[in-house]
C-alpha cells in the first residue's frame, strides 16, 4: 500500500540533489585553494541533517547551524556585492570582477544556487514531487530559511562600501519583500559599513530617465539612512557596455557613465 | 495611418475633471514605450505632463503636474489615460499623447484633445 | 528646468533656398549615458507635431535628407539645403536629457 505524501504547490527537490550538491563542493574547494580544508562529505551531511526527516514547513535557523558552520569562509568585507531581481548579470560581474563576490560565489551559496530540495516528517526520504511554496504553503520551509539565514550571515559580514544591483526592469525597483530588502537590509552592521551604493540596472532599451529618483529608491534610502548608513544611487544606464568596461576599463568609450 | 487616436474635445466647468485616452494601435510595442503627455496652450508653446510605462506602471511626473495629472494604462485595450483635477481656465489647452519611438524620443504623436474650461 | 531659447522667432524663406535655426538650452544636454537628446519637431499648420530630427543628427523614418541637424553642449542647429512649399509651420527644439522634458518657444518658417 503506497503511503499518502502530503503535496506541496512547490516543485520537488532537483533531480540527483545530493550528486549535485557534492559535486559542487568538490568542484569549489578545487577552485578555491582556502576552502582546501572542507570536507565535502561533512558538508552534505550538515546540509542533509538540516531538513531530511524534518517537517518541511517547520525549519528553522537553528537546523543550518552545523552546515554554516563547516561551510564558514571569509570573504573581503569590503567587496561584497548584493543583488535583487537580477541575478544573472550581478554573477556575470563577478566573474570578470574577480575581486568582488556575491553570495553564489560563497562556499554555501554556490552549493545552494537554482536547486530545490525538501524532506518529510519522520522519513529519511527527498521528496522530489513536490516542496512547498513559500507564498501558497509556508514561509519555513528548507529553501527559504537557508537563504535567510546564509543572506543574513553575508551581510553582517559586510564593511566600508556595499554594493547592490537592481533590476530597473521592475514596477519595484527596491522591493521589501525580496532577500535583500527583508533581510541584507536590516543586517547590515552600521558599525561597519559606511555607504550602501545602488546601481540601478536600466534594461535593454535606451533611456535617459534617472531611476535613482524612483519613490521605492528613495524608500531604500530612507530606511538606509535610518539605520545611520548613507546611501548613493548610480544608473547603469547600459548594461552590456558596463560589463564590457568592467572588462577592458582602458577603452576609450568607457569614460562616460554607463 | 493612425497609430495613437486620442479622446474627442471636452468642455469642463472650473473645479471639475476630465479624464482623457489615448488608444494604441500597436498593440506589440504599447506595454513596454513609455507614453507622454504632452499640453499646448497658445502662447505658451508645450509642456510635458508626464509618462508612464504601462506594462509595470512606473510612472514620471513633470514637478508642475504632480498635484494636477494622473496618469493609467490599460495594456489589454492598449490605452492611456490621463485625468486632469481641479480645472481652471489655466488648464485649457490642446493635450497630446505621444509615444517614444526610441529610447526618451517622441516619436508617434496622437491627434489631440481640446480641453475648454469656462463657467 | 532646463529652458530651451530658440532663435530666429520667425523667418520667411524663397522655396529653394536654405534655412537656418538655432537652439541653445541652458545647460549642457550630454546625458552620462553619452547620448545627446535633443531633438527637432515640425508642426504643420492644424496638425500635431512630427519628430524630424533626434538625438541632435538622426533623421526619423521618412524624412527627407533636405533637414539635418548638429551641434553639441548646449548649441544646436536645424538647417533645410533647400526649404520647400510643404516645410511651412512651426519648429520647435527638445530637449529628453533631463526630466521635465522640455521644449523650446518655437520658430514660424513662411515661405516667401
Known amino acids: 500500500v503506497p503511503r499518502w505524501r502530503q503535496q506541496w504547490s512547490g516543485p520537488g527537490t532537483t533531480k540527483r540533489f545530493p550528486e549535485t550538491v557534492l559535486a559542487r563542493c568538490v568542484k569549489y574547494t578545487e577552485i578555491h585553494p582556502e576552502m582546501r580544508h572542507v570536507d565535502c562529505q561533512s558538508v552534505w551531511d550538515a546540509f542533509k541533517g538540516a531538513f531530511i526527516s524534518k517537517h518541511p514547513c517547520n525549519i528553522t535557523e537553528e537546523d543550518y547551524q552545523p552546515l554554516m558552520k563547516l561551510g564558514t569562509q571569509t570573504v573581503p568585507c569590503n567587496k561584497i556585492l548584493l543583488w535583487s531581481r537580477i541575478k544573472d548579470l550581478a554573477h556575470q560581474f563577478t566573474q570578470v570582477q574577480r575581486d568582488m563576490f556575491t553570495l553564489e560565489d560563497t562556499l554555501l551559496g554556490y552549493l545552494a544556487d537554482d536547486l530545490t530540495w525538501c524532506g518529510e516528517f519522520n522519513t529519511s526520504k527527498i521528496n522530489y514531487q513536490s516542496c512547498p511554496d513559500w507564498r501558497k504553503d509556508c514561509s519555513n520551509n528548507p529553501v527559504s530559511v537557508f537563504w535567510k539565514t546564509v543572506s543574513r550571515r553575508f551581510a553582517e559580514a559586510a564593511c566600508d562600501v556595499v554594493h547592490v544591483m537592481l533590476n530597473g526592469s521592475r514596477s519595484k525597483i527596491f522591493d521589501k519583500n525580496s532577500t535583500f530588502g527583508s533581510v541584507e537590509v536590516h543586517n547590515l552592521q552600521p558599525e561597519k559599513v559606511q555607504t550602501l551604493e545602488a546601481w540601478v540596472i536600466h534594461g535593454g532599451r535606451e533611456d535617459s530617465r534617472d531611476l535613482c529618483q524612483d519613490p521605492t529608491i528613495k524608500e531604500l534610502e530612507s530606511i538606509i539612512s535610518k539605520r545611520n548608513i548613507q546611501f548613493s544611487c548610480k544608473n547603469i544606464y547600459r548594461p552590456d557596455k558596463f560589463l564590457q568596461c568592467v572588462k577592458n576599463p582602458e577603452d576609450s568609450s568607457c569614460t562616460s557613465e554607463i | 495611418q493612425v497609430q495613437l487616436q486620442q479622446s474627442v474635445s471636452e468642455l469642463r466647468s472650473p473645479g471639475s475633471s476630465v479624464k482623457l485616452s489615448c488608444k494604441d494601435f500597436?498593440?506589440?510595442?504599447?506595454?513596454?514605450?513609455?507614453m507622454s503627455w504632452v499640453r499646448q496652450k497658445p502662447g505658451h508653446g508645450f509642456e510635458w505632463i508626464g509618462d508612464?510605462?504601462?506594462?509595470?506602471?512606473?510612472?514620471f511626473y513633470g514637478e508642475k503636474f504632480e498635484d494636477k495629472a494622473k496618469l493609467d494604462a490599460d495594456t489589454v485595450s492598449n490605452t492611456a489615460y490621463l485625468e486632469l483635477t481641479s480645472l481652471s481656465s489655466e488648464d485649457s489647452a490642446i493635450y497630446y499623447c505621444?509615444?517614444?519611438?526610441?529610447?526618451?524620443?517622441?516619436?508617434?504623436w496622437g491627434q489631440g484633445t481640446l480641453v475648454a474650461v469656462s463657467a | 528646468d532646463i529652458v530651451m531659447t530658440q532663435t530666429p522667432l520667425s523667418l520667411s524663406v524663397t522655396p529653394g533656398q536654405p534655412a537656418s535655426i538655432s537652439c541653445r538650452s541652458s545647460?549642457?544636454?550630454?546625458?552620462?549615458?553619452?547620448?545627446?537628446?535633443l531633438h527637432w519637431y515640425l508642426q504643420k499648420p492644424g496638425q500635431s507635431p512630427q519628430l524630424l530630427i533626434y538625438?541632435?543628427?538622426n533623421r526619423f523614418s521618412g524624412v527627407p535628407d533636405r533637414f539635418s541637424g548638429s551641434g553639441s553642449g548646449t548649441d544646436f542647429t536645424l538647417k533645410i539645403s533647400r526649404v520647400e512649399a510643404e516645410d511651412v509651420g512651426v519648429y520647435y527644439c527638445s530637449q529628453s536629457s533631463h526630466l521635465p522634458w522640455t521644449f523650446g518657444g518655437g520658430t514660424k518658417l513662411e515661405i516667401k
Open positions: 500597436d498593440s506589440e510595442v504599447f506595454p513596454t514605450s513609455y
Open positions: 508612464i510605462l504601462p506594462n509595470i506602471g512606473r510612472i
Open positions: 538625438k541632435v543628427s
Open positions: 545647460q549642457s544636454l550630454l546625458h552620462s549615458n553619452g547620448n545627446t537628446y
Open positions: 505621444a509615444r517614444e519611438a526610441y529610447g526618451s524620443i517622441l516619436g508617434y
